[in-house]
C-alpha cells in the first residue's frame, strides 16, 4: 500500500483546512492508527490528533477544540483531519503516521500554507497645489502572508516608489505615488489597487485628489462701453476666476467707497440707474486659503448729451 | 504470561519514606507504560503517578506531586515509586499497572494490574 | 481533571437480571473509556476498553456502548460470579480519572 496526501495545503486565514492522509492499501489492509503531529524543523514532533480504530479520535491539549475528521461518511483507510480556524502559527509542516496491518508503519509529509489576506490602508500626502515640485499625493499600505502586491490605477501622471518590511510571518509593503500638482488634477480619482492570492479579487481603495489653485481674475461686463451711459438700467460688474477651495469675492472702489445704491452679491456688483457718480475705478478682490488675486476696472459713465465718448480702461492686477 | 508483583507495602509512621517495586514478566517492559493506582480502605481507585516506556516521561496526580517519584529500571523490568513525607491520607493498596503507548502520551486501557501492597501511614 | 460520574452506586440485582451501568465525562474524552470490574481483596479486571471493545477471555454478557462524553456497561444476563465493584476510566488526559465505582449486590 501507500499514502496518498498533497505536499502543500493552502489555506486562508480563518477558514478550515483539510490535512489529508489516505492509506491506498491492499485488499484484506486494514488502519490500526493515523497519527498527526507537527513536525517543524529544529523542533520535537507536536501531537496534533490520533485517529485511532477503536478509540476515535484524541486530541492534543494545544489542539483542542481545533481538530475533528471530516464529516461521515469515513472511509476506515481515511486518516485525514480538519484544522479548524487555521492561524498563522499553524504554518508549518505536518506529519501523518499510519499504522497498517499486517503491512506495518507508513509516514507522509505536507506543509500547511496559511495565506493572511491583507487590509490595506490609503494615506493621503500632504495638502496639494499648484506651483509645487514632485509632491506626495497618497501612500497605500497592505500587510500580508504572502506579500501583497500594491499597484495604483489613475489616469493622472504620476510616479510610483515601493518599500517592504518583512516581519517573523508576513510582509507589508507600502507604494507611494507622486506627483507635481495642477489644476487639471483636481476631482480626478487615484486608486491603490491590493493583489493577494488570498483575495478573491483586488481590493480597490480610492482616494479623489484635491489640488488647491486661485485662477486669475478678470472683470466681464465692460465689454460694450457705449452701454455704459446716464440712465441705464440693470448695469453690472462680474468677476471671473476659479479655484480649489471655491473662492470668495470682494468688491471694493479705489477711489472711494462704493457708491449708495450699488449692491454686491458674491462675484457681481450690480448697479441702479446709472449717474456720473458711479464713474470710477472698482477693484475684484478674489481669495481662497490657497493664494488671492486682483482685477481692477475703470467705469466712465457716458453722458448722452456729449457727442465724444469716453475711455474705458481694463486692468488687471495681481 | 504478563505478571506484575508489587513489594515494598508496610506500616510508616506520617512523615516517614517507603519504596515501592514493581516486577514485570512475561511481556517487553520498554513496549508499555506503568502507573501507579492506590485504593484507600473502602474507597474507590486512585490514579497516583505514570512513567513512559523509556522512563522520559512522568506524571503525578497534584495529591502527590512533589512528594512521590516514579521511575524504572528496564534492565531489571521493575517499576519502582519512591514515597516521601508521607500522610495519613495516603494510607491505601498500591497496585502497578501497564498500558500500552499508541503515540505521544496517549495510552490504552490498563490490561494488567498486580496484585497490590499495602502502606499503612499510622502514628 | 476530567470528572468521572458513575450511577448508580449500588444496585440490588438477581441472577439472570439484565444490568445497565452509566458513566459521564465531564468533557468529550471519544472512545478512551475503559470497564474495571474488582472483586473484594483483588486488583481491578480489564472488562471493556476502548468504550465498546470486550477484553480477551471476558464473557460476551458484558457490553460497552457510547462515545464522547456517555457510556454504558450492560450485562445482558447477571452471574453469581458477576457480583463485584465496576469501575468505568478515561485515559483520555493526563491525569486518568476512574468514576467512584458501582456496587453490584445479590437481591
Known amino acids: 500500500g501507500e499514502l496518498e496526501t498533497s505536499d502543500v495545503v493552502t489555506v486562508v486565514l480563518g477558514q478550515d483546512a483539510k490535512l489529508p492522509c489516505f492509506y491506498r492499501g491492499d485488499s484484506g489492509e486494514q488502519v490500526g492508527q493515523v497519527a498527526w503531529a507537527r513536525v517543524d524543523a529544529g523542533e520535537g514532533a507536536q501531537e496534533l490528533a490520533l485517529l485511532h480504530s477503536k478509540y476515535g479520535l484524541h486530541v492534543s491539549p494545544a489542539y483542542e477544540g481545533r481538530v475533528e475528521q471530516p464529516p461521515p461518511p469515513r472511509n476506515p483507510l481515511d486518516g485525514s483531519v480538519l484544522l479548524r480556524n487555521a492561524v498563522q502559527a499553524d504554518e508549518g509542516e505536518y506529519e501523518c503516521r499510519v499504522s497498517t496491518f499486517p503491512a506495518g508503519s507508513f509516514q507522509a509529509r505536507l506543509r500547511l500554507r496559511v495565506l493572511v489576506p491583507p487590509l490595506p490602508s490609503l494615506n493621503p500626502g500632504p495638502a496639494l497645489e499648484e506651483g509645487q515640485g514632485l509632491t506626495l499625493a497618497a501612500s497605500c499600505t497592505a500587510e500580508g502572508s504572502p506579500a501583497p502586491s500594491v499597484t495604483w490605477d489613475t489616469e493622472v501622471k504620476g510616479t510610483t516608489s515601493s518599500r517592504s518590511f518583512k516581519h517573523s510571518r508576513s510582509a507589508a509593503v507600502t507604494s507611494e505615488f507622486h506627483l507635481v500638482p495642477s489644476r487639471s488634477m483636481n476631482g480626478q480619482p487615484l486608486t491603490c489597487v491590493v493583489s493577494h492570492p488570498g483575495l478573491l479579487q483586488d481590493q480597490r481603495i480610492t482616494h479623489i485628489l484635491h489640488v488647491s489653485f486661485l485662477a486669475e481674475a478678470s472683470v466681464r461686463g465692460l465689454e460694450d462701453q457705449n452701454l455704459w451711459h446716464i440712465g441705464r438700467e440693470g448695469a453690472m460688474l462680474k468677476c471671473l476666476s476659479e479655484g480649489q477651495p471655491p473662492p470668495s469675492y470682494n468688491w471694493t472702489r479705489l477711489d472711494g467707497p462704493l457708491p449708495s445704491g450699488v449692491r454686491v452679491d458674491g462675484d457681481t456688483l450690480g448697479f441702479p440707474p446709472l449717474t456720473t457718480e458711479h464713474s470710477g475705478i472698482y477693484v475684484c478682490h478674489v481669495s481662497n486659503e490657497f493664494s488671492s488675486r486682483d482685477s481692477q476696472v475703470t467705469v466712465d459713465v457716458l453722458d448722452p448729451q456729449e457727442d465724444s465718448g469716453k475711455q474705458v480702461d481694463l486692468v488687471s492686477a495681481s | 504470561e504478563v505478571q506484575l508483583v508489587e513489594s515494598g507495602g508496610g506500616l510508616v509512621q506520617p512523615g516517614g519514606s517507603l519504596r515501592l517495586s514493581c516486577a514485570a514478566s512475561g511481556y517487553n517492559f520498554t513496549d508499555y507504560g506503568m502507573s501507579w493506582v492506590r485504593q484507600a480502605p473502602g474507597k474507590g481507585l486512585e490514579w497516583v503517578s505514570g512513567?513512559?516506556?523509556?522512563?522520559?516521561?512522568?506524571y503525578y496526580a497534584d495529591s502527590v506531586k512533589g512528594r512521590f517519584t516514579i521511575s524504572r529500571d528496564n534492565s531489571k523490568n521493575t517499576l519502582y515509586l519512591q514515597m516521601n513525607s508521607l500522610r495519613a491520607e495516603d494510607t491505601a493498596v498500591y497496585y502497578c499497572?501497564?498500558?500500552?503507548?499508541?503515540?505521544?502520551?496517549?495510552?490504552?486501557?490498563?490490561?494488567?494490574w498486580g496484585q497490590g501492597t499495602l502502606v499503612t501511614v499510622s502514628s | 481533571d476530567i470528572q468521572m460520574t458513575q450511577s448508580p452506586s449500588s444496585l440490588s440485582a438477581s441472577v439472570g437480571d439484565r444490568v445497565t451501568i452509566t458513566c459521564r465525562a465531564s468533557?468529550?474524552?471519544?472512545?478512551?473509556l475503559a470497564w474495571y470490574q474488582q472483586k473484594p481483596g483483588k486488583a481491578p479486571k480489564l472488562l471493556i476498553y476502548a468504550a465498546s471493545s470486550l477484553q480477551s477471555g471476558v464473557p460476551s454478557r458484558f457490553s460497552g456502548s457510547g462515545s464522547g462524553t456517555d457510556f454504558t456497561l450492560t450485562i445482558s444476563s447477571l452471574q453469581p460470579e458477576d457480583f463485584a465493584t465496576y469501575y468505568c476510566?478515561?485515559?483520555?488526559?493526563?491525569?486518568?480519572?476512574f468514576g467512584q465505582g458501582t456496587k453490584v449486590e445479590i437481591k
Open positions: 476510566q478515561q485515559h483520555y488526559t493526563t491525569p486518568p480519572t
Open positions: 512513567i513512559s516506556g523509556s522512563g522520559d516521561n512522568k
Open positions: 468533557q468529550g474524552i471519544s472512545s478512551y
Open positions: 499497572a501497564r498500558a500500552e503507548l499508541l503515540a505521544f502520551d496517549v495510552y490504552t486501557a490498563s490490561d494488567y
